[in-house]
């Protein structure tokens, strides 16, 4: 090996470089000194570094490392943050549209039920929004609340409009009767199943994206240990002490140092890979009953069908309720009355199927493809940082932490470093507590994502089949797959034009307001501006 070149006799270059890091020259020797107090840049001869300079170099090295890490994750971080915001806003838009579709359905088909119906629909969709944002609401309770509230209004306004005002105290009795008599058939249960499945998946999807942001933020703001700071100082700055200002660290040496410094961070890799793959699996399953866009935008139709079901059975219901609620003051309000086989609907009910163009679905798939390009992000981090910091190409004429070498040898470098610092020890320390915490969170979300990932090709759960519904009857090529009342199922051709739509706010007054009775073929109304052909909730 060639001997190190003689250091700058006056330390002039070192002084001018160091001044850029630390204004003032009081810490820089004017001429090389023995440097016996140095702890990191251990000299083989006279040195232009002092202990104070060494400390400053360590601080700078750690700051450099933090900046390199932040710039390494910038693209990934922006990708997830932007998508989390976009999806959250998009989901809110879907909820708003679903509410407006439902209100429009009431306005056009049951004007006598408004404004009470608007109030109950509004509360239901507020609950939906709260649920998506993470509130602990039970979906079954939400749906029961909607139908419990609607039935007294349907009964007193549609089925028995001649009731005197004094009879309005039967509302409580009607709420109880709603469940006891299964007045809406199995529609509430169908809605519970569809809404709970689609919202659970939506919620976990948003939670997963937000956790992704948390993971990146955690690793982005890691504070590197003093040991790592010493290794980085030795790699980036100790050459200066010998006056070697233009020398770059050896690439192989950089990789060894980075792997040591990032040993804890790299432990995230396994769970990060699993996170992206699990998220992909979830997204692949987000269709039909598991797609909130599809389910919520079709709710107005199912609610309409449920009211038609009540109307169809109005005769029997009015008689039964007349007896049940005639003396509502005396009635014990509890679910205890189950008449034999009252109005059990065996009708085939098919699940909403939405034609996706540029919908949330395509946007989700696009996100997954981009995320997959970051699947090796954590394992590739040491290499990435080395490739984005100055290193000598081909490991020739480079700095190995102690001296200038013609060719880098990992073994020689490791042997040379043994007395100064043990790389193996750094790896053995294990991840920082914050990294351990984020690994635990990743494990948890991965578990949730795996639990939520849907078996392919299933539309409805078996437990619904037992309720008299047929599952799996919606072929991928079928359009007419919403509702089942037989009088013209509504085709929802959903073109939520994604980014354009995000700027849009829709009021119930903007919803289809054509109150004339239309045949299914007349239902194709071009409306909602850039929404494309959304089929009106008219029947």
């Amino acid at each position: 090996q060639p001997p190190p070149p003689p250091p700058d006799a006056t330390c002039h270059q070192v002084r001018s470089f160091f001044q850029r890091l630390q204004p003032g020259l009081k810490w820089v020797p004017e001429t090389p000194v023995p440097g016996s107090d140095l702890q990191v840049c251990l000299p083989k001869g006279p040195t232009c570094c002092s202990r104070k300079m060494e400390e400053k170099y360590q601080l700078t090295a750690r700051l450099n490392m933090e900046q390199l890490l932040q710039s390494a994750s910038m693209e990934l971080k922006f990708l997830i943050i932007q998508n989390a915001a976009v999806f959250q806003e998009a989901f809110e838009i879907v909820v708003r549209h679903a509410k407006n579709y439902t209100n429009a359905m009431f306005k056009n088909n049951y004007p006598s039920l408004t404004p009470q119906a608007f109030e109950f629909v509004g509360e239901f969709f507020t609950d939906v929004s709260l649920y998506i944002l993470g509130s602990d609401i039970n979906v079954d309770d939400m749906v029961n609340e909607l139908f419990d509230s609607l039935f007294p209004v349907i009964y007193t306004q549609l089925m028995n409009p001649g009731l005197p005002d004094s009879a309005l105290d039967i509302n409580e009795c009607l709420r109880g009767a709603r469940r006891d008599l299964k007045v809406f058939g199995n529609f509430p249960k169908l809605i519970m199943t569809q809404v709970s499945k689609s919202l659970q998946v939506t919620r976990i999807f948003l939670q997963a994206l937000n956790l992704g942001i948390e993971v990146i933020n955690t690793t982005d703001h890691l504070k590197f240990s003093k040991d790592c700071g010493r290794m980085l100082t030795r790699m980036w700055y100790c050459s200066y002490c010998q006056g070697l200002m233009m020398v770059k660290p050896c690439g192989g040496y950089c990789n060894v140092v980075m792997q040591g410094c990032m040993a804890g961070v790299v432990e995230i890799d396994k769970y990060w890979r699993e996170y992206i793959l699990s998220l992909e699996e979830l997204v692949n399953g987000m269709y039909r009953i598991y797609d909130m866009e599809n389910v919520l935008l079709g709710l107005f139709s199912t609610i309409h069908d449920s009211i038609q079901y009540v109307q169809k059975n109005a005769g029997k219901l009015t008689t039964t309720i007349g007896k049940l609620c005639a003396h509502s003051q005396q009635r014990q309000y509890r679910s205890a009355y189950y008449p034999e086989d009252l109005f059990i609907d065996k009708k085939v009910l098919k699940v909403a199927h939405v034609e996706h163009e540029e919908t949330l679905s395509s946007r989700r798939r696009e996100l997954i493809q981009k995320l997959k390009s970051f699947i090796s992000f954590y394992s590739a981090l040491p290499g990435y940082i080395c490739s984005h910091s100055p290193v000598a190409e081909n490991d020739t004429l480079c700095w190995n932490g102690q001296e200038l070498v013609e060719r880098y040898s990992q073994k020689a470098a490791r042997n040379g470093m043994k007395n100064q610092f043990n790389l193996h020890e750094l790896k053995m320390k294990g991840p920082e507590p914050v990294v351990s915490q984020i690994i635990d969170k990743l494990k948890h979300i991965n578990q949730l994502l795996r639990t939520m990932s849907m078996p392919k090709g299933r539309v409805l759960d078996k437990n619904l089949d037992e309720e008299g519904f047929e599952s799996g009857d919606c072929g991928d090529d079928e359009d007419e797959c919403i509702g089942g009342s037989g009088d013209g199922m509504i085709k929802v051709k959903n073109q939520l034009r994604f980014l354009a739509e995000l700027a849009y706010d829709l009021d119930v007054d903007d919803a289809p307001g054509n109150s004339q009775q239309a045949t299914p073929k007349d239902n194709e109304i071009s409306t909602f501006h850039n929404l494309g052909n959304v089929h009106s909730p008219l029947k």
Epitope: E123, S135, D140, D141, N144, E145, G176, R334
Partner: antibody
Amino acid sequence: QVQLQESGGGLVQPGRSLRLSCAASGFTFSSYAMHWVRQAPGKGLEWVSAISSSGGSTYYADSVKGRFTISRDNSKNTLYLQMNSLRAEDTAVYYCAKDRRGSHADAFDVWGQGTLVTVSS
Amino acid sequence: QSALTQPPSASGSPGQSVTISCTGTSSDVGLMHNVSWYQQYPGKAPKLLIYKSSSRPSGVPDRFSGSKSGTSASLAITGLQAEDGADYYCQSYDSSLRVVFGGGTKVTVL
């Protein structure tokens, strides 16, 4: 007539347990969320706990979390509050209240007359 | 969860108007959540006056009205009467669906 009647209050030593009950009548109990609210002597109202109509979701104030448990029996039209590890600061009149909705907290449109719980040695 | 902020007291002569404010945060009142108002006489259970920020249950006089804007809500009592002297509480819920009450406002009819 819509009514809520609390019972089970009384004098209890710190660290001990007590179970409050609330009997509901005049409305479809299984259709509404229910709450416990307390009021210490001379102080304001403090929400304690809530339960959704089905019992599927429960909610607690930080001050009682882990010590109190809310439950309901829809077949008996009764709401319960199991209070463990009682402290002096739990001394209050405990009200049972009916929500106007079933899924979660909104507004309390019917209140009981309250039952006094005194925690003292 | 922290309480909503109400003034401790308010007063007015019969026939006058009184407004009570209730200030929360973006995670309770400011969210999509409703605000309710209650009236309580000493030694009695509270009574619901306003729900959904501005709706009145049947039986509550239209002298009582509620409104909400941003993270604040208010209760207005017009044409103050002697029986309006009582404690008034506002209530909402936070993003975890836990209920929050205001500290209460004592209204005195002079």
